[in-house]
Interface confidence: low
């Protein structure tokens, strides 16, 4: 290889070893017979060399810095060429570096030839191997403007007071252009400006200087967005860190054309503006840090450029205003990531502040449209407390757990509505009576309905899940002993249609001792499945549950046990089981940590089955599930 | 280097807490996925928990949904894992792992045991 | 929740021989299979990732493959310190992951 570099050319080549690998052989650069693992050549040097192995590639590399001195003379502007041309270099990994200083009064503006630029941060890398890194300087200090690739949508770079650009090139690559050209400008008054052009829909992600290091200290930076008019950009922070701040606030402004109030100033953790339509500006402002403890600002974003969707001039006006206690938050479902381009899913309140999710409380009324390309990515969560503090103006109030109809005219569904019913610890109990009796969920008899009710403990300390009920069984109320939550979950898009079938009594009662009673009257038709609660993880330590079985006059209940026995084990206490006749109080007691569950038994009259657990030992717990069938009586008994 | 390091394993009683910590060098935990896998004793990989702090992405297990709580500290570049109401069948080699590829990059592993 | 059969639970070889395991996913998973090794008293390592890309530093003796919802680890060429518990692993939903229930490749 030969390289000669002209006496004015103001370039200099080093070779050198690259990041260290684990090769068997190692190489050397050969000039004259002597080997070096280094070899450096100013302006006005010629040098012949080779190297001691086949594939140089895997042991060196190849910088060619170009210093541009524009404070002494004319600034060569115009489009950058590769000198030493490509061709001329031996096939190492190359870096070619320009490093232009200017005064400060003067803007210089790199301007990228289409393929544009795309930014890329920390762990990441670009798929050809080329990439662009940018710094600008502040007096003497380099700041990073940042990493980028090809096939963006980064069009121009406007600093001041000089800049330093490295274009990297794996040493595979045939390019031989540059793909840049530098103009001058007049003083932009900030660190720089990023201008990023989008010819269609599509997303960039951008970061402040020096990111993930800290923004430079009372700084300005500025994007500026050039978007398509019949397209909408939203913008949301990725991440972000604040400083510790003296003077002035950190902040983010937006120059938005069109809009009354400019420019827009908000704080990194507001939400960000969402759904603008037309060309728009950001700019980033540090402030003066503390001293003693600066901190570090920086801040990562994503701009999402995107057609309108037919939704996204629909404002939905959602009037919490007559609710208490509620909270309504509209999420993406859980779904897996795609890789390629995915348009935002945005719901937006008063169609400004635009976020992947929102939440909506009680109090007010919220008008909210959605940006969004498919409105099934997004669901609906409700919250809604009823609690009683004083148990003599609770006691036999009732309350209709129902979602209330203006949900149903949101374009999103409805995934959870839950009601937590808080009581008076000791002082009263709580009844859910369905509007159409209840099935309980079993692996032996599944719910098909677009809807379940999820019945369990609202007490932190305890584990404690009733289980899963639909409409369309033989449960008729459900009493439980103190504070649950009742969440109404959602299977289909068919519960808009099953929405009438929805509809529970809540009602303060005395309190009562038991953890739950539920009142049954079976069906003619069909087996009733019950369970204990807690299934597959055990009725907790000394909880006890009772079932009352109604028996129509015509009918004989069978009740069947599920296993022979319980499998449970007591540390301490008693498992044990009564089944009570209600007509005679006549009552059997079984040990159900001792005995065989009882064989299949007839009932002619109505009878309760109480369970009452002790403390079971770990991995043996209590787990029962039974069922009834009703047929008629051939000889009256009575 | 990258190197992933947890801590906080121990004997723990039934409905006991512990927390685990992973902390992370030679890469920033905002950027991955970060999870905790267990293995009990003479038994296979179950995945427990995942989170991507950078977007406040949380999922877990059917088995210790409710129980157990994920979350980082990137300004400490830790992941860590709140197990509370603890059972026997948490008794596990407690790993925590960086995702990329697959799990590309895993801890030594923190016992928990649960008993009485 | 996608369930991964791995076969088989474990199997006897020799240095030298080719072994084959096996990973069925009970739905469609892309490509989105990885393969582990694992010692005992180690965590895993990865082998393989997107069903068939090497991962970095593996030896080349390892391969995968994938056939609709089959997928295979080879192993061309057992070596000494190739003895250990393999284990796929699915991630096409992204949640819960799930593992199939381990191969152990013993000495014949």
């Known amino acids: 290889f030969e390289i000669a570099l002209p006496r004015e050319s103001n370039i200099t080549v080093l070779i050198k070893l690259g990041t260290p690998t684990l090769l068997a052989k190692p190489c050397y650069i050969v000039i004259s017979k002597r080997h070096t693992t280094m070899l450096s050549i100013k302006p006005g040097e010629r040098i012949l060399f080779t190297f001691s192995c086949q594939s140089p590639e895997n042991h060196f590399v190849i910088e060619i810095q170009k210093n541009i001195d524009c404070m002494s003379g004319p600034c060569p502007f115009g489009e950058v060429q590769l000198q030493p041309s490509t061709s001329l270099l031996p096939t190492l990994n190359r870096t070619f570096i320009w490093d232009v200083k200017a005064h400060k009064s003067i803007g210089l503006e790199l301007q990228f030839s289409i393929p544009r630029l795309r930014q890329f941060g920390p762990g990441e890398s670009c798929p050809d191997g080329v990439t662009y890194s940018i710094s600008g300087r502040i007096d003497a200090t380099v700041v990073r403007i940042g990493t980028f690739c090809s096939n963006g949508t980064v069009s121009r770079i406007k600093m001041q007071e000089g800049v330093k650009m490295a274009l990297h090139l794996p040493w595979f690559h045939p390019r031989n252009v540059s793909g840049f050209s530098i103009a001058n400008r007049s003083s932009i008054k900030r660190l720089c400006i990023i201008e990023s052009v989008f010819e269609g829909e599509g997303s960039a992600t951008l970061m402040s200087a020096n990111y993930p290091e800290g923004f430079p200290e009372d700084e300005l930076m500025t994007w500026q967005f050039v978007i398509p008019a019949h397209l909408r950009a939203s913008v949301s922070f990725l991440n972000f860190n604040l400083s510790n701040c003296e003077r002035k606030e950190e902040r983010v402004e937006y120059y938005i054309p069109g809009s009354t109030t400019n420019p827009e100033v908000f704080k990194l953790e507001d939400k960000q503006p969402g759904n603008m339509a037309g060309n728009f500006n950001l700019s980033l402002q540090g402030c003066d840090q503390d001293a003693q403890n600066p901190g570090i600002l920086r801040l990562q974003f994503q701009v999402l450029v995107q057609h309108p969707q037919n939704e996204s001039n629909k404002i939905y006006v959602v009037d919490l205003s007559n609710e208490r206690a509620t909270s309504l938050t509209i999420e993406p479902r859980p779904v897996k990531q795609s890789r390629k381009f995915v348009p935002g899913c945005f719901v937006c309140l008063e169609s400004r502040t635009c976020s992947t999710n929102l939440t909506l409380t009680s109090g007010s009324k919220h008008k909210i449209s959605f940006l969004c390309d498919n409105l099934t990515r997004l669901w609906m969560n409700v919250e809604k407390n009823i609690s009683c503090t004083d148990h003599r103006y609770c006691q036999r109030k009732s309350y209709s757990l129902q979602v209330p109809s203006d949900i149903f005219h949101l374009p999103v569904e409805l995934h959870d509505f839950s009601w937590k019913l808080l009581v008076p610890k000791d002082r009263l109990s709580l009844v859910l009576v369905p509007a159409q009796k209840l099935q309980q969920h079993t692996h032996e008899k599944p719910c098909n309905t677009s809807f379940s009710y999820l019945v369990a403990s609202a007490i932190p300390s305890q584990d404690l899940y009733f289980g899963s009920f639909c409409p369309g069984g033989s449960i008729e109320q459900i009493q439980v002993k103190q504070n649950i939550s009742v969440t109404l979950r959602t299977f289909a898009p068919s519960f808009r249609q099953e929405a009438s079938r929805q509809g529970l009594t809540v009602s303060f009662i005395p309190y009562f001792k038991e953890e739950g009673v539920f009142t049954v009257t079976p069906d003619t038709k069909s087996k009733v499945y019950l369970r204990t609660p807690n299934w597959d993880r055990g009725l907790p330590s000394l909880t006890s549950v009772s079932w009352n079985i109604s028996v129509p006059r015509d009918q004989v209940a069978c009740l069947t046990f599920f296993k022979e026995r319980t499998g449970v084990v007591c540390q301490t206490g008693r498992a044990f089981m009564i089944i009570q006749e209600q007509r005679t109080r006549a009552e059997e007691i079984f040990s159900l940590d001792e005995d065989a569950l009882p064989k299949p038994r007839f009932h002619h009259h109505s009878f309760w089955v109480n369970i009452s657990n002790c403390s079971p030992a770990s991995g043996k717990q209590l787990d029962l599930l039974f069922w009834v069938t009703l047929t008629p009586r051939t000889v009256d008994l009575t | 280097e990258v190197q992933l390091v947890e801590s906080g394993g121990g004997l723990v009683q039934p409905g006991g807490s512990l927390r685990l910590s992973c902390a992370a060098s030679g890469f920033n935990i905002s950027y991955y996925y970060m999870h905790w896998v267990r293995q009990a004793p003479g038994k296979g990989l179950e995945w427990v928990a995942s989170i991507y702090s950078s977007y406040g992405y949380t999922s877990y297990a059917d088995s210790v949904k409710g129980r157990f709580t994920i979350s980082a500290d990137t300004s400490k570049n830790t992941a860590y894992l709140q197990m509370n109401s603890l059972r026997a069948e948490d008794t596990a080699v407690y790993y925590c792992?960086?995702?990329?590829?697959?799990?590309?990059?895993w801890g030594q592993g923190t016992l928990v045991t649960v008993s009485s | 929740d996608i369930q991964m059969t791995q076969s088989p639970s474990s199997l006897s070889a020799s240095v030298g021989d080719r072994v084959t395991i096996t990973c069925r996913a009970s739905?469609?998973?892309?490509?989105?299979v990885a393969w582990y090794q694992q010692k005992p008293g180690k965590a895993p390592k990865l082998l393989i990732y997107?069903?068939?890309s090497l991962y970095s530093g593996v030896p080349s003796r390892f391969s995968g493959s994938r056939s609709g919802t089959d997928f295979t680890l080879t192993i061309s060429s057992l070596q000494p310190e190739d003895f250990a518990t393999y284990y796929c692993?699915?991630?096409?939903?992204?949640?819960?992951?799930?593992f199939g229930q381990g191969t152990k490749v013993e000495i014949k």
């Open positions: 792992a960086r995702v990329y590829y697959g799990f590309d990059y």
């Open positions: 692993q699915q991630s096409y939903y992204v949640y819960p992951i799930t």
């Open positions: 739905q469609s998973v892309s490509s989105a």
């Open positions: 997107s069903a068939s």
